[in-house]
């Protein structure tokens, strides 16, 4: 089959997922498209353990994740439920701030320099993280 059983070159494996960490910046939508052409998605953080793993790799640099509210409610790009899921916002965030003077509010989430999350203008050219899950079937034990 075409399912992945190991991570591509230059990707990092962690807990049955593969991660790719950019070293340059793009707008959120362009980063999202980059990941999708690689059969991945912007990183979806589902636990404190995953948060610490990503934070360790990106360092103190603004970095896009796969969370946005461009169509109203906050949504993870892979469909993970936002309301019941893991969150790590900075205090008083998200605030959909309009004071930046760039038009509109703030609809895309990113890791800040301390790892906590902030909402920001989606056109800002931040680094990003792609994530793809390894073949689910490969987690099952082999038939004897």
């Amino acid at each position: 089959g075409s399912e992945r059983t190991c991570c591509p070159v230059n990707w990092v494996e962690h807990e049955r997922s593969c991660y790719w960490f950019s070293r340059s910046g793009k707008a959120w939508a362009d980063a999202d498209n980059y990941c999708r052409l690689e059969d991945a998605h912007l990183v979806v953080v589902t636990s404190w353990e995953e948060q610490k793993f990503v934070q360790h790799h990106i360092g103190p640099v603004n970095t896009w994740m796969g969370l946005h509210d461009q169509n109203g409610p906050w949504k993870w790009v892979d469909g993970t439920d936002y309301e019941t899921g893991f969150k790590n916002w900075r205090p008083e965030q998200p605030d959909d701030w309009y004071g930046h003077g760039l038009g509109g509010g703030e609809d895309c989430a990113h890791f800040t320099d301390d790892g906590r999350w902030n909402d920001d203008v989606c056109q800002r050219p931040y680094r990003w993280v792609c994530e793809t899950e390894l073949d689910k079937a490969s987690q099952e034990p082999p038939l004897l």
């Epitope: 340059s24 707008a27 498209n33 052409l37 690689e38 059969d39």
Partner: antibody, heavy 121, light 107 residues
Framework: EVQMLESGGGLGQSGGSLRLSCTAS????????MSWVRQAPGKGLEWVSA????????FYADSVKGRFTVTRDNSKNTLYLQMNSLTAEDTAVYYC??????????????WGQGTLVTVSS | DIQMTQSPSSVYASVGDRVTITCRAS??????LAWYQQKPGKAPKLLIY???SLQSGVPSRFSGSGSGTDFTLTISSLQPEDFATYYC?????????FGGGTKVEIK
């Protein structure tokens, strides 16, 4: 050696359809993003479409959106471009290209030899 | 869409000359830029990616520079096999777009 061999070009009617094929070899096709790029006679290069390795994600130029469909059959190492509602502006050499992801960008390498599509009115 | 503008559209040069081709993006594209060479009747070939990285097998007389909106392809000492058309391509965002091309011709 990485190779792509296009086929299916030829004469098409305005308003009609054609399907291009590209058979790839020499690399792991199933995990490689692929693309179509075209070049009208005597003109420059124009990106047409791209598709992820699994085929789940596709991208199109505005000029072909809604008319062209890119698909792939990974069991046959083959990429397709279904071209509908053809117009004279679609006359071009169509190149099948392997997409490489480097340093956060998507680039084209290598290229097939191309197949000529001529649309007559 | 990001427009890519190349200049000049053609350049006349002799073997041994230093040739410089420029490419300008309509908005900033960081270093997401490639250069291709195309000879008549042939498919394009990748020369430079990520603005300045030389693709494997490409002679070192080719070099790329620039970031943001302005980029340059330089051929340090033109060889007979370098007479061709050169295209830039931005890889910052979809749709991926090419410059109009620069034809390097014999003086």
């Amino acid at each position: 050696e990485v190779q792509m061999l296009e086929s299916g070009g030829g004469l098409g009617q305005s308003g009609g359809s054609l399907r291009l094929s590209c058979t790839a070899s020499g690399f792991t096709f199933t995990t490689s993003a692929m693309s179509w790029v075209r070049q009208a006679p005597g003109k420059g290069l124009e990106w047409v479409s791209a598709i992820s390795g699994s085929g789940a994600n596709t991208f199109y130029a505005d000029s072909v959106k809604g008319r062209f469909t890119v698909t792939r059959d990974n069991s046959k190492n083959t990429l397709y471009l279904q071209m509908n509602s053809l117009t004279a502006e679609d006359t071009a050499v169509y190149y099948c290209v392997k997409v490489i992801a480097v340093a956060g960008g998507h680039f084209f390498d290598p290229w097939g030899q191309g197949t000529l599509v001529t649309v007559s009115s | 869409d990001i427009q890519m503008t190349q200049s000049p559209s053609s350049v006349y040069a002799s073997v041994g000359d230093r040739v410089t081709i420029t490419c300008r993006a309509s908005q900033g594209i960081s270093s997401y830029l490639a250069w291709y060479q195309q000879k008549p009747g042939k498919a394009p070939k990748l020369l430079i990616y990520a603005a300045s990285s030389l693709q494997s097998g490409v002679p070192s007389r080719f070099s790329g520079s620039g970031s943001g909106t302005d980029f340059t392809l330089t051929i340090s000492s033109l060889q007979p096999e370098d007479f061709a058309t050169y295209y830039c391509q931005q890889a910052n965002s979809f749709p991926l777009t090419f410059g109009g091309g620069t034809k390097v011709e014999i003086k």
